[in-house]
């Protein structure tokens, strides 16, 4: 997805909650065997954080060889370290698989800040803490990268979650989502809990700290609070929702709704920042700067290339505002919004000069691709990716960081006229996205 | 070790273009932002311009409609383009790297001394 | 864009001496103050980042203070390897802007 702090229309009436219950998750709609309930074996099974990207451990090949994968719904390759590199303490060894096949075919992804490459081969895979199941799943094995592995964030490789459309090097590379839905009786969805530290971690605190789960094949009622409300997949490529409206503490941004969503609105776990077109990122930079202004803050910071600090324990959150992005729904003329705070979009980070501090970044950034919810919007929300019924769905997190005055929020129905002018539709090209 | 080092071509004849490279070792370019800083002979220091991390870039205002900053991250190089040089712009020219956590220019090069005469 | 004036622009001063630099910002620059050391030979170095904070490496006879426009840089003990050019810059507002500098000299 892409690397940076990846490593990027019609405003419609966004009014007061409507007096009807619009249908959503919680109704009483049958449900498919093992959609629901728990998932014991599943919960906790990501580490990391939202800077370097949450991993969960796979093991390929026969004998199985573990690594940490980097679960990304911005691509749709399953790729791994396969060749010695200074940031991988292990790598894929293929010719220690009895099992590994070559595909006799190479791929080539670059990105806009680095590349990998490799040889594309199939091979057995299994989740330790996911379902009870092997899959014979592509891999490509990565032999040559630039700037891709990253210093110390302990995965080797990536599990791209999107679809086929955007696999690399075209869309008849099946990926590894729709190989595990079509050899086992695993239900087409997943869904993901991350959850930021609020704190910066140190390496062995992110070793031993427990990033949030990844639930294949269901839904975990442990892992939200509330009602989960559902926004349609505008395409399957990557996970393409359409925002109808922005809220910067209430007040509405006013911009035409085409613009949030130009050129398109992805939800993406390999991205650190909430990444908004250069126009939104503009009016949304402005607005949180009006409502923080209590505070002087340096350019470099609203650039996302210079820290604030302030002494241990004492940083303002009550003067930065909370933002609200509101999701087309279900129904005709029906959204729903979910809200976050500044304890998401205020990454912490390590003050290297001194620990007395507690130091931010500011993590909305500007993109030329489109909105990209990452990592600073997950970690307030559980994110239920139902490829089934073509639909992602947001609840509170029941781990998001907040304070006593305020909490993460996911509300609705609203009445919300002509959404469907909000979506951009994009010449078609092949991009793809990871962690900046 | 972190390093820049400034290669210009010390001479430019009036209205002619100035190019200076600005290469680096031991950070990357994708991490750390490079800015280019000028001193004319016996005068202070004037900010030039800036290349974020993510390659977009921030210029002086005055003189902004003559200068362009562009990399490349493979080769460690920051370029610092200038156009219609006049005597004026007769300087020591620094690449110097900006630190977010500092919010400073951390480490500069030891600068390349550019010339504008006929 | 913000101006940074130091309004001496020479001093002189004996080693052993403490010797104080000041800067004044045209507005609120909220300590995104720092400042900076270029030798004889044009090396330039940083001192002193976010009004009073050192950088690695900078001999603890260095402090910075100040807050709002005034700011000021403090050598407390002057030594010969001090002999230099001392410029402060504002990191708050883009365009960044330097002082004109205040140089230092051994009476």
């Known amino acids: 997805t892409q690397h940076g702090i990846r490593l990027p229309l019609r405003s419609g009436l966004g009014g007061a909650p409507l007096g009807l219950r619009l249908p959503r998750e919680t109704d009483e709609e049958p449900e498919e065997p093992g959609r629901r309930g728990s998932f014991v074996e599943m919960v906790d099974n990501l580490r990391g954080k939202s800077g370097q990207g949450y991993y969960v451990e796979m093991t390929v090949g026969s004998p199985p060889q573990t690594l940490n994968i980097l679960v990304d719904t911005g691509s749709s390759n399953f790729a791994v370290g396969a060749a010695p590199h200074p940031f991988l303490h292990r790598y894929y060894q293929r010719q220690l698989s009895s099992t590994y096949r070559d595909l006799r075919k190479g791929v080539y992804v670059p990105y806009t800040q680095g590349k990998w490459e490799g040889e594309l081969g199939t091979d057995l895979v299994s989740i330790p803490h996911g379902p009870n199941v092997t899959v014979r799943a592509n891999i490509a094995a990565i032999t040559e990268s630039d700037k891709f592995f990253i210093n110390g964030s302990n995965w080797e490789g990536i599990l791209g979650l999107a679809y086929a459309e955007i696999a690399r090097p075209d869309d008849s590379l099946e990926p590894f989502f729709d190989s595990l839905v079509k050899q086992t009786h695993v239900p087409n969805l997943f869904s993901l809990q991350l959850c930021g530290a609020g704190f910066p971690l140190n390496q062995s605190e992110v070793l031993a700290s427990v990033g949030g789960s990844m639930i294949i094949g269901g839904i975990d009622h442990s892992l939200y609070t509330g009602s989960l409300w559902y926004t349609p997949i505008r395409r399957e490529w990557y996970y393409e929702v359409i925002i109808v409206r922005v809220e910067i503490n209430g007040q509405d941004l006013k911009m035409d709704c085409k613009e949030y969503n130009y050129d398109k609105s992805i939800v993406d776990s390999g991205t650190t920042n909430l990444r908004l077109p250069k126009k939104v990122f503009e009016a949304a930079v402005k607005s949180i700067k009006a409502a923080s202004s209590t505070e002087k803050f340096p350019d470099g910071f609203w650039l996302g290339e210079q820290l604030v600090c302030w002494q241990a324990g004492t940083t303002p959150w009550n003067i930065f505002p909370v933002i609200s992005l509101y999701l087309m729904g279900e129904v005709t003329n029906q959204s729903f919004r979910i809200t976050i705070l500044p304890q998401q979009y205020l990454r912490p980070v390590e003050d290297v000069a001194t620990s007395q501090d507690d130091c931010y970044k500011f993590a909305i950034s500007q993109s030329s691709t489109g909105t990209v919810m990452g990592a600073v919007i997950m970690e307030g929300f559980y994110v239920v990716f139902d490829r089934a019924r073509k639909r992602i769905g947001f609840a509170v997190s029941a781990c998001h960081v907040h304070d006593e005055f305020r909490t993460a929020a996911v509300e609705g129905p609203f009445v919300t006229l002509d959404m469907e002018d909000c979506g951009y539709n994009i010449p078609q090209t092949d991009e793809s996205t990871l962690m900046t | 070790e972190v390093k820049l080092m400034e290669s210009g071509p010390g001479l430019v004849a009036p209205s002619q273009s100035l190019s200076i490279t600005c290469t680096v070792s031991g950070f990357s370019l994708t991490s750390y932002p490079i800015n280019w800083v000028r001193q004319p002979p016996g005068k202070g220091l004037e900010w030039l311009g800036v290349?974020?991390?993510?390659?977009?870039?921030n210029y002086n205002s005055a003189l902004k409609s003559r200068l362009s900053i562009s990399r490349d991250n493979s080769k460690s190089q920051v370029f610092l383009k200038m156009n219609s040089l006049q005597t004026d712009d007769t300087a020591r020219y620094y690449c110097?790297?900006?630190?977010?956590?500092?919010?400073?220019?951390?480490?500069w090069g030891q600068g390349t001394t550019v010339t504008v005469s006929s | 864009d913000i101006v940074m004036t130091q309004t001496t622009s020479s001093l002189s001063a004996s080693l052993g001496d403490r010797v104080t630099i000041s800067c004044r910002a045209s507005?609120?620059?909220?300590?995104?103050l720092n400042w900076y050391q270029q030798k004889p030979d044009g090396t330039v170095k940083l001192l002193i980042y976010y009004t009073s904070r050192l950088h690695s490496g900078v001999p603890s006879r260095f402090s910075g203070s100040g807050s709002g426009t005034d700011y000021s840089l403090t050598i407390s003990n002057l030594e010969q390897e001090d002999i230099a050019t001392y410029f402060c810059q504002q990191s708050l507002s883009l365009p960044y802007t330097f002082g004109g500098g205040t140089r230092l000299e051994i009476k």
């Open positions: 290349i974020w991390t993510g390659g977009s870039t």
């Open positions: 507005q609120d620059i909220s300590k995104y």
């Open positions: 110097a790297r900006w630190d977010g956590y500092f919010g400073a220019f951390d480490y």
